[in-house]
Every structure is written in structure tokens, then in C-alpha cells.
């Protein structure tokens, strides 16, 4: 029986240019993790393999850091990085626990805009 | 240039344990991951495990139990061992290397392959 | 485990043209699936990986496209040197599975 939960940092929001960390956390399950995938839509992002270490795919590599810990970092973000992000994490003996980040970029914020048109 | 090279006994009687051993050249194999594959006759490839660069192992869950994958750092060699084999473990066994990093588990060198067949 | 189904099982091409080889996925791997050459008497060699990606001194002649569970090696003029059978395998979780090989010939 599976009985894991996988807490993400949900919706979340950053800057184009900017960078974000996606993570997830699995928990109330004694299954061992045997492989964590990232994937955004029919794109595989990384995979981290408790025993091999990381695999960013080659799409991705200039712009996809392992880390912190399971979780991955997406720099010099676009407005096109916009959309669903997923944690699969593969366990034995559970089997495969799934987790959903929303992701949106937004342009730079009202308050550099502002700034952009202040009258001296 | 990476070399492996394996070595065995090409007959073995069922019931017993098949032993292989991989001899590697050119690299050391306390990076990456250091795999047996094999291939029984007019079937498909069988990937069976792996030890990796920390020493840790991973077999097929069909393999489980009669399998095991160990090596010796001073020799730069690992070895494999397959207990009760039956006529259906008559195949081809390639010992191969995997750079997870840069190609996931894509195997990017094979050794030349080894003919295993257990007959009484 | 992930079952890699491969079509069709033998291809004869004419020198020049092109040879498509298909591969399916008993589920979702997204683009975890590498192509392998093996001629006969050797062992198996990379040519593929992440899908679309061609391994160190591939020819361009070899290309692979795909996603999710649908994947496709296609040579694009056949050259006697490749004949050989070819191998999809899907690293998308383990155990890593093959499949069955599709022998390509020359027509």
C-alpha cells in the first residue's frame, strides 16, 4: 500500500531572467528512493539516481542546475518556462509517487517599471 | 580510450553459478557505473546491474535473488555472479560502462562480449 | 517493467535511400531512450541518446525524434556500412529495458 505524500512548493512565481528553485519532499512512507525524475510536460528536465548521481538532459543542460538536494534549479528563465513542472519519484517497494509545481514568469515587476518612469 | 574485456568460463552446468569477471583499461572504475548486460539467443538485450562508482549496486528485479555485482578497485575490475542457472541463462554477457552524468543510462562503451552456455 | 516494442522486426533499403525504424513504449518515458548499432560478431554500439541526440562521431545521416511513447531512428541515405541490427532501450526508470532489434539489409 502506498502510503507517501509529496509536499512541492506549489504555485509559484519569478522574474524573466531570474532564477527558481523547484522542490519537492516526500514523506509518511519508509519506501527507498531510488530515482527522482523532472520532468515539464513530455520533456524530461533531470534525473537523480540515488546511486549514480545527476542527469540534466541535453535541452537543458545550459540552463538546468541539480540541487539543492532533490530539487532543481531553473536559471535565466523566459516567459516561455511557464507551465507544470513534475517530481516522479520512483520508490521500492511503493512504486511511483507524483508531485505538480505551477511555474509562471512573469515580465519585470510594476516596481521597475515604476522606477523606469519616475519624473526626477 | 576505454577498454573492458571479459572473462569466464563459456560452459557451466545447471544449478551451479555462473562467474564473469570485467577487466578495465583506460579508466578507473571508481567513476561512473559498471553494468552487465546480456543477450540469450534470438532475444533481446537483458540489462542485469550495475555497481557504481561508490560501490553501491543495483540488480533487475528479476535477477534479484541470484545475482551479484562486486569489484576490486586495485585490479580495476568487477565481476559478476549468477547462481542456479538454468538453460535460459545461456546468452552472450557483455560487461559496459555508463557515464549517468552525461548520457543517463545510455551505454556508451561495451566490452566485445562473452558466450555462456549452461548444459550439463 | 517498461516494455520497448520495436517495428518492423527486418527493413531491406536500397543504397541511398532512407531506413525508418520505430520504437514504442509501454508507457511515458519522455525522451529517455538511446539507439545502439550492433554489426554482426560485435558488440553494440551508441548512437543515440536523450532521443534526438547523436553520441561522438555518429554520422549526420543518423538522426532520432521522438517523445513520450512514440520514438523513430531514421537513416537518412543507407550506406552499406550500416547494416546491422538496431536497438531502442529507455533509461526512463529502472530496470533499463531494450528492445527486440530491427535488422536492416540492403534491398
Known amino acids: 500500500m502506498m502510503t507517501g505524500t509529496i509536499e512541492t512548493t506549489g504555485n509559484i512565481s519569478a522574474e524573466k531572467g531570474g532564477s527558481i528553485i523547484l522542490q519537492c519532499h516526500l514523506s509518511s512512507t519508509t519506501a527507498q528512493v531510488t530515482q527522482v525524475n523532472w520532468e515539464q510536460q513530455d520533456q524530461l528536465l533531470a534525473i537523480c539516481n540515488a546511486d549514480l548521481g545527476w542527469h540534466i538532459s541535453p535541452s537543458f543542460k545550459d540552463r538546468v542546475a541539480p540541487g539543492p538536494g532533490l530539487g532543481l534549479t531553473l536559471q535565466s528563465l523566459t516567459v516561455n518556462d511557464t507551465g507544470e513542472y513534475f517530481c516522479i519519484y520512483h520508490t521500492y517497494p511503493d512504486g511511483t509517487y507524483t508531485g505538480r509545481i505551477f511555474l509562471e514568469v512573469l515580465e519585470s515587476s510594476v516596481a521597475e517599471h515604476g522606477a523606469r518612469f519616475q519624473i526626477p | 580510450e576505454v577498454q573492458l574485456q571479459e572473462s569466464g568460463p563459456g560452459l557451466v552446468k545447471p544449478s551451479e553459478t555462473l562467474s564473469l569477471t570485467c577487466a578495465v583499461s583506460g579508466y578507473s572504475i571508481t567513476s561512473d557505473s559498471w553494468n552487465w548486460i546480456r543477450q540469450p539467443p534470438g532475444k533481446k538485450l537483458e540489462w542485469m546491474g550495475y555497481?557504481?562508482?561508490?560501490?553501491?549496486?543495483y540488480y533487475n528485479p528479476s535477477l534479484k535473488s541470484r545475482i551479484t555485482i562486486s569489484r576490486d578497485t586495485s585490479k580495476n575490475q568487477f565481476s559478476l555472479k549468477l547462481s542456479s542457472v538454468t538453460a535460459a541463462d545461456t546468452a552472450v554477457y557483455y560487461c559496459?560502462?555508463?557515464?549517468?552524468?552525461?548520457?543517463?543510462?545510455?551505454?556508451?562503451?561495451w566490452g566485445q562480449g562473452t558466450t555462456v552456455t549452461v548444459s550439463s | 517493467d517498461i516494455v520497448m516494442t520495436q517495428s518492423p522486426d527486418s527493413l531491406a533499403v536500397s543504397l541511398g535511400e532512407r531506413a525508418t525504424i520505430n520504437c514504442k513504449a509501454s508507457?511515458?518515458?519522455?525522451?529517455?531512450v538511446a539507439w545502439y548499432q550492433q554489426k554482426p560478431g560485435q558488440s553494440p554500439k551508441l548512437m543515440i541518446y536523450s532521443a534526438s541526440y547523436r553520441y561522438t562521431g555518429v554520422p549526420d545521416r543518423f538522426s532520432g525524434s521522438g517523445s513520450g511513447t512514440d520514438f523513430t531512428l531514421t537513416i537518412s541515405s543507407l550506406q552499406a556500412e550500416d547494416v546491422a541490427v538496431y536497438y531502442c532501450q529507455q533509461y526512463y526508470t529502472t530496470p533499463w529495458t531494450f528492445g527486440g532489434g530491427t535488422k536492416v539489409e540492403i534491398k
Open positions: 555497481i557504481s562508482y561508490s560501490g553501491n549496486t
Open positions: 559496459a560502462r555508463l557515464d549517468f552524468s552525461n548520457y543517463g543510462g545510455a551505454v556508451d562503451y
Open positions: 508507457q511515458n518515458v519522455r525522451t529517455a
